[in-house]
């Protein structure tokens, strides 16, 4: 089958301070040596692009400056991080994975990571 | 909204270059993989290249590889085809489309006819 | 390379009848990665399905996409006279991206 399989966790939960990390694993049909990973988030039927980055095989990953993610690669395996989230950026966001160089070019999508973000409380004021 | 806009096709003799070009605007081109599609008068459609974000990865459809050169200039928001050692069987409708989010071409271009002919 | 072979080449039916479309793969194409097309006389084509079953924006509902392996079809439930065209199955998972040969849907 010529086709890329993309796995990835069903849900995950941010942190207090709206940082949520999910591992993105494909299943490489060939040998790529340069690949491209996105992150899209799906919400109320309408696709947005999160980040994205292009990274050689072994190398890490680079996020432009200005990006919300962070990630790692080890081997097919893609550990990315998301930060700056608020409740209203619960969603589902999903791992796209394209491998670029050297053809055949493949594409893969995961069925997407549903991210449940809960504002924080605010600290309630001290009597003492 | 999103638009896609052909330029450069005509007549032209076997052997003869000639350069396509693709004006896209209501999108940020560099986001977006672009492709060229061909179709053959009277014929079904034909895939002939691919240009990937920032213009560093290119495929191309055996039929056309060392003769076709598929660029962009995001900066100006346009893609180009250019067609050397053209062959009579190069003559086509050709159209320029867009990659989206799914991998899937969602937006083409009204397209523009080449002819090469003696 | 994945070849699509599309049946009948040619469907000669009614408007209100229902239009079934087959696609079939050389070799198994993931479900998320195949598409549908509609092309009109001096038209482009126009994006219908994706994902071999999901429509794509301002697709009425009676276009419908279902399919896994190597097996896809296109169904149009009721023809409409606007329905009258060319349909293309695509792969769009790996380089070469393929299209079928097209089915013609003609008021018979």
């Known amino acids: 089958c010529k086709a890329m399989h993309v796995a990835q966790p069903a849900v995950v939960l941010a942190s207090s301070r709206g940082i949520a990390s999910f591992v993105c694993e494909y299943a490489s049909p060939g040998k790529a040596t340069e690949v491209r990973v996105t992150v899209l988030r799906q919400a109320d039927s309408q696709v947005t692009e999160v980040c994205a980055a292009t990274y050689m095989m072994g190398n890490e990953l680079t996020f432009l400056d200005d990006s919300i993610c962070t990630g790692t690669s080890s081997g097919n395996q893609v550990n990315l991080t998301i930060q700056g989230l608020r409740a209203m950026d619960t969603g589902l966001y999903i791992c796209k994975v394209e491998l670029m160089y050297p053809p055949p070019y493949y594409l893969g999508i995961g069925n997407g990571t549903q991210i449940y973000v809960i504002d924080p409380e605010p600290c309630p004021d001290s009597d003492f | 909204q999103v638009q896609l806009v052909e330029s450069g096709g005509g007549v032209v003799q076997p052997g003869r270059s000639l350069r396509l070009s693709c004006a896209a605007s209501g999108f940020t081109l560099s986001r977006y993989g672009m492709h060229w599609v061909r179709q053959a008068p009277g014929k079904g459609l034909e895939w002939v290249a691919v240009?990937?974000?920032?213009?560093?990865?290119?495929n191309y459809a055996d039929s056309v590889k060392g003769r076709f050169t598929i660029s962009r200039d995001n900066s100006k928001n346009t893609l180009y085809l250019q067609m050397n050692s053209l062959r009579v069987e190069d003559t086509a409708v050709y159209y320029c489309t867009r990659v989206d989010w799914w991998g899937v071409f969602d937006f083409w271009g009204q397209g523009t006819l080449v002819t090469v002919s003696s | 390379e994945i070849v699509l072979t599309q049946s009948p080449g040619t469907l000669s039916l009614s408007p209100g009848e229902r239009a079934t479309l087959s696609c079939r793969a050389s070799?198994?194409?993931?479900?998320?990665?195949l598409a549908w097309y509609q092309q009109k006389p001096g038209q482009a084509p126009r994006l219908l399905i994706y994902?071999?079953?999901s429509r794509a924006t301002g697709i009425p509902d009676r276009f419908s996409g279902s399919g896994s392996g190597t097996d896809f079809t296109l169904t149009i439930s009721r023809l409409e006279p606007e329905d009258f065209a060319v349909y293309y199955c695509q792969q769009y998972g790996s380089s070469p991206w393929t299209f079928g040969q097209g089915t013609k849907v003609e008021i018979k």
């Open positions: 070799q198994s194409v993931s479900s998320s990665y």
């Open positions: 240009t990937w974000y920032d213009g560093s990865n290119k």
């Open positions: 994902g071999a079953s």
